[in-house]
């Protein structure tokens, strides 16, 4: 069961896996959650009754029964991992710890104006896990305003000590705040040299890449496929690093694949969720249980529901045996990966889906796109909402996109003349406007947050957030879309769609069924040529066909320009303005969402 509260002055006895140092019990719980085996933990807070060398220790624990005996101990704080919980989990930690020195390898020292600047520096440095900043009150003159960037093998401090007039904190890479580029490509027939920091077994290069992404020291990886000539290295995933943060060489080798950690854009990719099945593949590991199951899907469910299960192998039933049920082997290992992978034995293997909640909901695969046609089908664009005003009469006002369970992203210009959020209603999971009746459930709007630099759509900053009065329960027909990563600024999106209930031509009416149109992006230079009277800034993005014919129009405003990249949909633009609708050589102009990621996160993550 899920236990979220912390147990004060309580220590769990036994079951120790490893000890790490964390600045708080809350962060110890996060570390436990992300550790492949940890189910419980005991944290020691600073206390006069405790030996200072034990302050800030976070002991990660495991137990076959999922619990351990409790012992009273002053300054001890214990609790359970969030693995047992169904709610969304994030590794993002924005807390700043005053008068704490988090020890690690100090690999970079520079002057910074503030702790915030130091944290930003850490977030934008590929090696940095955490930092310590000496404030201007620090006793030693030559160390004042010094920002120390640090890393360790585990990503957590090697020790934490009390030190007056310093502050410490963690990199915000896991908060989607890094400007580091993400190289999402996997390079075939390529081996990276440089230093191996770890190695695990993986069924394919994609799983290897995800393991690299959540490994604190991994910056890039090489994976040897099952056709690799050296048998002992088949399915081996080498996790790598280098001083520069990039591979120093490219080595061409058949049957090997290489790629990069996606730590800077992990909010918009699945990292923990290995949802594929691997046929004719057996995963070896410590056996947890063997149960009968009707199918490999049923076996995966059993693994997902068993909190200690990390992966499984299903052996289908022999002809008429055991009521057609096969054997489901539930397994685990010290690092969450199989200890060996074998092929040709007829098993079907896969991983627990329990960890999927550690990924952003927006990375979940949605049903395949319907090719052709202009009318959408239900569940095709589950982030699209219709924003209604009830004054003077109820009508569709604008589109919008679900980006969080209490947040809609839309255009600022939609709220011209809107005096109060009370007159607004947000409908999600809607395909046809005609579905909306008196008794149709909706979300009330608690707050309208318009960008404070917004004046008019044509001059930019045409972006607004709606904070909903209640939270959205995600389903197949209503779920969030990922924000683009700042590290993806160089990505060329080729599969972009604009959606909405807006006009189909300039003089028309709101459409009943949600419309869709695939539209190519246009460079800002090209767009500027088409709008000589306007300034097309880098905070805008344009899309449209040279010959016209497909475009957003009145009523689509605030809705998404959604682009699919690496199987994940990203909210690349917000429908903003344009000259007419679908006119020749007049592309639509959209708010360039990637340029507002900081603003969105600042507003949505404000305490």
């Amino acid at each position: 069961e899920c236990v979220t509260q912390l147990l004060k002055d309580t220590c769990f006895e036994g079951g120790d896996i490893t000890t790490v140092f964390t600045p708080s019990a809350k962060y110890c719980q996060v570390v436990c959650t992300y550790h492949p085996r940890c189910l419980l933990f005991t944290f020691t807070a600073e206390s006069p009754s405790e030996d200072p060398t034990r302050w800030f220790t976070c002991v990660l624990k495991d137990s076959v029964t999922e619990t351990l005996p409790r012992v009273n101990r002053t300054a001890a704080i214990s609790g359970y991992s969030f693995k047992q919980c169904s709610h969304q989990i994030s590794a993002c930690n924005k807390d700043i710890y005053v008068d704490l020195d988090m020890k690690g390898i100090n690999y970079n020292s520079s002057v910074a104006k503030s702790a915030q600047e130091c944290q930003e520096r850490c977030t934008d440095d590929v090696h940095c896990h955490f930092f310590t900043y000496a404030t201007r009150q620090f006793p030693s003159l030559e160390h004042r305003n010094i920002c120390l960037l640090k890393h360790t093998q585990t990503g957590t401090p090697t020790r934490i000590t009390k030190l007056d007039k310093v502050v410490s904190g963690f990199s915000l890479k896991s908060c989607a705040l890094s400007n580091l580029a993400c190289i999402r490509d996997i390079f075939p027939n390529t081996v990276f040299a440089d230093s191996n920091i770890d190695s695990v077994m993986a069924p394919d290069a994609f799983v290897c890449g995800r393991i690299c992404t959540h490994h604190p020291g991994c910056l890039f990886f090489t994976f040897f496929s099952q056709e690799w000539p050296k048998e002992s290295q088949r399915n081996l995933c080498l996790l790598k690093t280098s001083e520069s943060g990039l591979p120093s060489t490219r080595i061409k080798k058949s049957k090997a694949l290489s790629g990069f950690s996606l730590q800077s854009c992990r909010h918009s990719i699945p990292v923990f969720c290995h949802s594929s099945f691997y046929h004719d593949t057996d995963f070896l590991g410590e056996e947890l249980d063997i149960v009968a199951a009707k199918s490999h899907e049923a076996c995966q469910k059993l693994c997902t529901n068993a909190v200690r299960c990390q992966f499984f192998t299903y052996t289908p039933a022999q002809a008429s045996c055991n009521e057609g049920k096969g054997k489901c082997y539930l397994k685990l290992s010290s690092n969450g990966s199989p200890t060996k992978i074998l092929h040709g034995r007829g098993g079907i293997s896969g991983y627990t889906l329990r960890l999927c909640k550690m990924d952003n909901e927006c990375t979940t695969k949605i049903k395949p796109r319907i090719v052709g046609g202009t009318a959408s089908v239900r569940g095709e664009w589950p982030w699209q909402v219709t924003l209604h005003t009830t004054s003077p009469t109820q009508r569709h006002l604008c589109g919008g996109s679900i980006i969080g369970n209490q947040w809609i992203l839309t255009a600022a210009h939609c709220f011209y003349g809107v005096e109060s959020p009370k007159i607004l209603r947000v409908y999600s999971g809607i395909l046809n406007q005609s579905e909306i009746k008196e008794d149709t459930s909706f979300f009330g709007v608690q707050e309208i947050i318009i960008h404070d630099q917004y004046k008019m759509a044509e001059s930019g900053y045409d972006i607004a957030l709606l904070k909903l009065e209640t939270t959205v329960n995600y389903t197949d027909s209503q779920r969030p879309i990922c924000l683009p990563s700042k590290g993806d600024r160089n990505v060329i999106y080729t599969d972009c769609w604009v959606t909405g209930w807006g006009y189909r031509k300039l003089r028309d009416k709101i459409q009943n069924t949600l419309q869709k149109a695939k539209i190519p992006l246009v460079t800002n230079e090209e767009c500027q040529k088409r709008y000589r009277g306007h300034k097309i800034t880098h905070k805008m993005i344009c899309a449209g066909y040279r010959e016209g014919g497909k475009d957003a129009c009145k009523g689509d405003s605030g809705g998404p320009l959604s682009c699919k990249h690496n199987e994940v949909w990203h909210l690349v633009g917000i429908t903003s303005w344009g000259e007419g609708c679908a006119q020749r050589e007049r592309p639509g102009v959209y708010t360039n969402v990637v340029e507002y990621v900081d603003w969105i996160l600042e507003k949505t993550q404000a305490v």
């Epitope: 993400c182 490509d185 390529t190 160089n490 990505v491």
Partner: antibody, heavy 120, light 107 residues
Framework: EVQLLESGGGLVQPGGSLRLSCAAS????????MTWVRQAPGKGLEWVSS????????LYADSVKGRFTISRDNSKNTLYLQMNSLRAEDTAVYYC?????????????WGQGTMVTVSS | DIQMTQSPSSLSASVGDRVTITCQAS??????LNWYQQKPGKAPKLLIY???NLETGVPSRFSGSGSGTDFTFTISSLQPEDIATYYC?????????FGGGTKMEIK
């Protein structure tokens, strides 16, 4: 027609700087590794630097590391080579080339080259 | 770094002759070797990639073979338009390196 066109070469003094450009057309520039190769007068070919399609990963020959910077602008279909602290031994025709193949490393399209002369 | 040794450095042959150039790598490069032709004042042109694969549009009189450390490039029947310098290039790892070149002349 698939084409690469270099520009920006010229005469420069030792210690000086120069920026070469290479305009690409006729293919999807943003999906290829791009490379600079140089050829000193009467000499053979020397690999200088390569850059991945999205620009996030660059590689350099030891002879230019720390002095030259390769970059690209995919929206302009253009490859660049910023050359600083130039030396007499950098005098050469500089070619930009497109890499092809499953893992790159073979150059199937070349520009016509631009001459860089470093001399006082 | 992988050194590439090409021989001969120059070669004189008659039209119609079968001509062979060799290239030796300082370490095993599997079949990761490419051959280029460069005519005076022009950019190089890819002829053969991965030791033996003929690039599209290249006449079939050009061929390549070898693997490991020893490679051969052959023109089965030399034509006047084949007057050029030929280079081998290893594509096994960066830094990518070229052979010193073989200058082809007609007798």
């Amino acid at each position: 027609e698939v084409q690469l066109l270099e520009s920006g070469g010229g005469l420069v003094q030792p210690g000086g700087s120069l920026r070469l450009s290479c305009a690409a057309s006729g293919f999807t520039f943003s999906t290829y590794w791009m490379t600079w190769v140089r050829q000193a007068p009467g000499k053979g070919l020397e690999w200088v630097s390569s850059i991945w399609s999205s620009g996030g990963w660059t590689l350099y020959a030891d002879s230019v590391k720390g002095r030259f910077t390769i970059s690209r602008d995919n929206s302009k279909n253009t490859l660049y080579l910023q050359m600083n602290s130039l030396r007499a031994e950098d005098t050469a025709v500089y070619y930009c080339a497109r890499e092809v193949g499953a893992a790159g490393f073979a150059f199937d399209i070349w520009g016509q080259g631009t001459m860089v002369t470093v001399s006082s | 770094d992988i050194q590439m040794t090409q021989s001969p450095s120059s070669l004189s042959a008659s039209v119609g002759d079968r001509v062979t150039i060799t290239c030796q790598a300082s370490q095993d490069i599997s079949n990761y070797l490419n051959w280029y032709q460069q005519k005076p004042g022009k950019a190089p042109k890819l002829l053969i990639y991965d030791a033996s694969n003929l690039e599209t549009g290249v006449p079939s009189r050009f061929s390549g073979s070898g693997s490991g450390t020893d490679f051969t490039f052959t023109i089965s029947s030399l034509q006047p338009e084949d007057i050029a310098t030929y280079y081998c290039q290893q594509s096994s790892s960066t830094p990518l390196t070229f052979g010193g070149g073989t200058k082809m002349e007609i007798k």
